[in-house]
Interface confidence: medium
């Protein structure tokens, strides 16, 4: 008999369902906008916007202060009075659209759908370890705005983006607005514009930079900014658009728009179409040859990775890389394939793509056909040829034109297609330790702490745990607060520890010891915790093996049994060499010889799967009682491993010991050339892992085994004569004495 | 029993480079972390950094980063040290050490080797 | 980088007294500290990890406590083989770092 110990799915180790509580805050309404902010004299403060109102929070989640930011023309509406009396527009509710922080005075910003989409900016001053907001200012001058020319109407009802950066003693605000037709014809926000702020907060400095969908493209090609981000010398936009100026707005895909951080200039505004794709290992028939694309960006996160993934990508240690979530559609509807897929684009890398594309259409030779591209914002032209021109002029540089790069940078899904199921709402990448940890939001509330690597087969979780009760998706925007992130989700905000929320998730010990050292998960005699929850009984040292199984369940009282146990933590080396005197089995009174592995019956455990065997002969003492009885594993001495060494005693019930007897043999006689079927009759004739008839001391080969019957074929005899016919189990012989008579053929 | 055996004393010539072994045996080398730690004369203890020979993966300290290569050769068992650009400030014994489980612990150590770097 | 503070530098001590050693950590590392002996000429010898766990084969007189920032190890009663060198060593981060040691002799 070969029995294997049956495999014990690695998702075993684990119970996602395992409720736990982090702090949160009721915003009183759908969260617009959160954003934090952590000064040097340790205070800080959580700004969380809702519609006609900002909360500022303490880094409790308890309320500091509110501020009424609408409706328009409301006479309790804080903000508004700012801009001295009005009516400065038509009435209606505020829905935030921009929260961001001016980290150089420092200050809150916010703007709005109402008021032309107008900004204020709130002086933040620290209280202790809190923050409270100055009484706004209003960043708008009616003498400088008018409906075509409107350096202070920043945000777009459908959407906008900003990002602050300093350049010298000024802020300048990198804003992106999604537009259409409406939006375009009241107050003219533009598509991509670098506002400076003027230095006695009135507003934005005139005169600014720009880049606006054409008129003709705004109802058929409408860009939607997704993130945006600043790193290095340069801002980055994501954007969501439709493929093509001219072909089926429907068909869309992802960029990247890439702006110069150090000069307020839209000259050197670049643009690349980065390609998200599912390569599954194993290519389904009629599968694209490059992998299923995922042209759409859900949501967006850069950060320094730590080694592993470095590693993986190909770039050292602590270096930029963004990523994204994409989904096959704007609907994100399950196609073939995962309904997310995370793809990972290394800074450097599409710095040198964006460089290497300008080189393309602006150095000999020229490649004829080459288009600049950004239709959508500019007159279509060849390269080397501004928007617009047949030719360079001798005092214009091709390089000081916006262009779109002419190839796309591809990567594909690092989960490998894992993430299955799972709508991915939000996204955000820290570096723990060595550890790259994507946290994601879900569409159906849950927090997946997860770790970002390449090589495996299976997701390596810190965690994966519902916010709340509510179910409600997580929303795009997350914030990061000492070591916490903050997530939204309907009208809460949540805190959740960058750490993972707690270790109850992990329901062995050695799947607890493995965790992640920042996870700070020891064992607490029967659970996985924290050491705040079970200071008596908490260690990160040891863990005790775990029988689950074992085989058979029953030995003859006379006689060995091989016996094989199943669990885990017996060795914790694959070879299965088990160090001299470490382990001790005993069953009943009666030890249990430990055997070296069979080498020939190692089989490779694919990771996904855990369990471990360990062999044992069992010679039952003189004094061993027939009946049920305990299996018992004691494992001292072993060595540490990598993560814990292995200490203690695992008891197993659900063993017998049992006497075989043999009740009768027929027939009793048979041809001296053998194949007489005999049938041996009696009780407990199958317990243990050996048997065997003997007839005249040769084997008769065995056909079948059950408790009260064994039948076996006779081998040819000698001559014709009466023979012994004796059964052993377990090596000993049953009692009773039996002959066979073989006769003439 | 556990036993790190490492390579003998070396004299070298500022500038030069010394490589140090460390021949582990009575365990499974790729069950734990091997670190490396250096002690000038009269001085106290200067952690280097250390390998995981199961994976290569290797951490060090950014005083010694970019002159240290810590290397494990798991068909021998032996894990090495090897120090670059060598000055007079590196004269010291160097000792390798068995990293304990994941604690960051050192439970067994090598007998030391010593290094003089001179002119 | 986290900075392990050990004091005294040396202390001397009679055969049968508590001796106390403290390290200071310069940044919260929880129970992540081990404490070392070494005779001279000779490796160091593991004797406390993880703050308070007694190593394999250490004889009961030694102990550790402590956690965050703050940890004392103690010989309950000095014995003349205890002369040596005591090092603590903090495992929360790389790169890992050791105290100064301190120096024990006997009165």
């Known amino acids: 008999e070969d029995w294997q110990c049956p495999r014990t799915p690695y998702a075993a180790s684990r119970d996602f369902d395992v409720k736990y509580v982090v702090p949160s805050f009721s915003a009183g309404g759908l969260v617009q906008a959160m954003v934090t902010y952590e000064g040097d004299r340790n205070e800080s403060a959580v700004f969380v916007a809702i519609r006609n109102r900002l909360h500022v929070l303490g880094p409790d989640l308890k309320s500091v202060q509110s501020l009424a930011t609408g409706p328009a023309g409301d006479p309790g509406c804080q903000t508004c009075a700012a801009c001295g009396p009005g009516p400065h527009g038509p009435p209606g509710d505020t829905d935030t659209k921009v929260l961001v922080l001016d980290p150089a005075l420092p200050a809150l910003v916010s703007c709005g759908s109402s008021l032309q989409g107008r900004c204020f900016l709130h002086d933040l001053e620290p209280q202790g370890t809190a923050v409270h907001l100055a009484a706004p200012a209003c960043l708008f001058s009616a003498h400088h705005n008018r409906p075509d020319d409107c350096p202070d109407c920043v945000a777009s009802p459908l959407g906008t983006r900003v990002t602050v950066v300093e350049q010298g003693q000024a802020s300048y605000f990198y804003v992106a607005s999604s537009l259409d037709a409406a939006v375009a014809a009241s107050f003219s926000p533009r598509s991509v514009s670098i506002r400076r702020l003027k230095a006695d907060a009135s507003g934005f400095a005139p005169g600014f930079v720009a880049l606006s969908v054409l008129p003709k493209h705004l109802v058929s090609y409408s860009i939607e900014y997704v993130h945006s981000f600043h790193t290095g010398a340069f801002v980055y936009f994501l954007t969501v658009q439709p493929a093509s100026v001219t072909d089926d707005p429907s068909a869309l895909h992802t960029r990247l728009a890439r702006l110069s951080a150090t000069e307020p200039e839209l000259g050197d505004y670049r643009e690349l179409v980065l390609d998200c794709r599912f390569a599954p290992k194993r290519r389904r028939r009629g599968a694209p040859e490059g992998g299923q694309p995922y042209p759409v960006l859900r949501v967006a996160h850069s950060a320094p990775v730590g080694a592993q993934l470095a590693t993986e990508l190909s770039i050292a240690e602590g270096q930029e890389v963004l990523f994204g979530v994409f989904v096959t559609g704007k609907d994100g509807g399950p196609g073939v394939g995962p309904n997310s897929v995370v793809c990972a684009f290394p800074i450097d890398l599409l710095d040198t793509l964006i460089d290497e594309g300008v080189e393309r259409c602006c150095e000999s030779p020229v490649h004829p056909g080459l288009r600049r591209g950004l239709d959508f914002f500019q007159s279509p032209s060849f390269c080397p040829n501004p928007p617009g021109l047949e030719a360079l002029s001798p005092n214009t540089s091709c390089r000081h034109f916006p262009l779109l790069v002419s190839s796309s940078f591809s990567r594909v899904d690092l989960f490998n297609g894992l993430l299955g199921p799972v709508q991915v709402t939000a996204l955000y990448v820290t570096r723990l330790d060595n550890v790259t940890v994507a946290h994601m939001g879900t569409m159906d509330g849950r927090i997946l702490q997860v770790e970002l690597v390449r090589s495996l087969n299976y997701l390596l979780y810190v965690s994966n745990f519902s916010l709340g009760d509510s179910g409600q998706p997580v929303q795009r925007d997350v914030s990061r607060l000492g070591d916490h992130l903050l997530f939204a989700s309907g009208d809460q905000v949540f805190q959740v520890p960058i750490q993972g929320p707690g270790c109850r998730h992990f329901l062995t010990c050695g799947r607890c010891l493995r965790a992640w050292h920042f996870m700070g998960c020891g064992w607490c005699g029967n659970m996985c915790g924290q050491q705040k929850e079970c200071p008596g009984s908490w260690q990160q040292d040891h863990c005790p093996p775990k029988l689950t199984e074992f085989h058979p369940h029953s030995g003859p009282l006379r006689g060995s049994t091989r016996l094989t146990l199943c669990g885990s933590n017996f060795y914790l080396h694959p070879s299965g060499l088990v160090p001299e005197g470490t382990h001790q089995v005993t069953v009943g009174q009666s030890p249990c010889r430990p055997l070296p592995k069979d080498s020939s019956k190692l089989r490779p455990v694919p990771r996904k799967d855990f369990v471990e065997e360990f062999e044992c002969e069992l010679e039952p003492l003189g004094t061993q009682a027939v009946g049920p009885t305990n299996v018992s594993l004691t494992v001292t001495n072993m060595p540490p491993g990598k993560h814990f060494r292995v200490d203690g005693t695992s008891v197993l019930r659900g063993f017998s010991f049992m006497e075989p007897v043999l009740i009768a043999v027929q027939p009793l006689f048979g041809p001296r050339a053998g194949g007489t079927c005999l049938t041996l009759e009696g009780q407990s004739l199958s317990v243990g892992t050996s048997r065997a008839v003997l007839v005249n001391g040769t084997e008769c080969l065995l056909a079948r085994v059950s408790e009260g019957q064994l039948l076996c074929a006779t081998p040819p005899g000698a001559t014709v004569a009466s023979v012994p016919l004796s059964l052993q189990v377990g090596g000993a012989q049953v009692p009773g004495s039996w002959t066979f008579q073989y006769r003439e053929d | 029993q556990v036993q790190l055996v490492q390579s003998g004393a070396e004299v070298k010539k500022p500038g030069a480079t010394v490589k140090i072994s460390c021949k582990v045996s009575g365990y499974t080398f790729t069950d734990t972390y091997i670190h490396w730690v250096q002690q000038a004369p009269g001085k106290g203890l200067e952690w280097m950094g250390r390998i995981d020979p199961a994976d290569g993966n290797r951490k060090s300290d950014p005083k010694f980063q970019v002159r240290v290569t810590i290397t494990a050769d798991t068909s021998t068992d032996t894990a090495y040290m090897e120090l670059s650009s060598l000055r007079s400030e590196d004269t010291a014994v160097y000792y390798c050490?068995?990293?304990?489980?994941?604690?960051?612990?050192?439970?067994?150590w090598g007998q030391g080797t010593l290094v003089t770097v001179s002119r | 980088d986290i900075q392990m503070t050990q004091s005294p530098s040396s202390l001397s001590a009679s055969v049968g007294d508590r001796v106390t050693i403290t390290c200071h950590a310069s940044?919260?590392?929880?129970?992540?500290l081990n404490w070392y002996q070494q005779k001279p000429g000779k490796a160091p010898k593991l004797l406390i990890y993880k703050a308070s766990n007694l190593h394999t084969g250490v004889p009961s007189r030694f102990s550790g406590s402590g956690s965050g920032t703050d940890f004392t190890f103690t010989i309950s009663s000095l014995q003349p083989e205890d002369i040596a060198t005591y090092y603590c060593q903090q495992g929360q981060s790389y790169p890992l770092t050791f105290g100064g040691g301190t120096k024990l002799e006997i009165k």
């Open positions: 050490a068995r990293g304990y489980g994941n604690l960051n612990a050192m439970d067994s």
């Open positions: 940044q919260n590392i929880n129970v992540w």
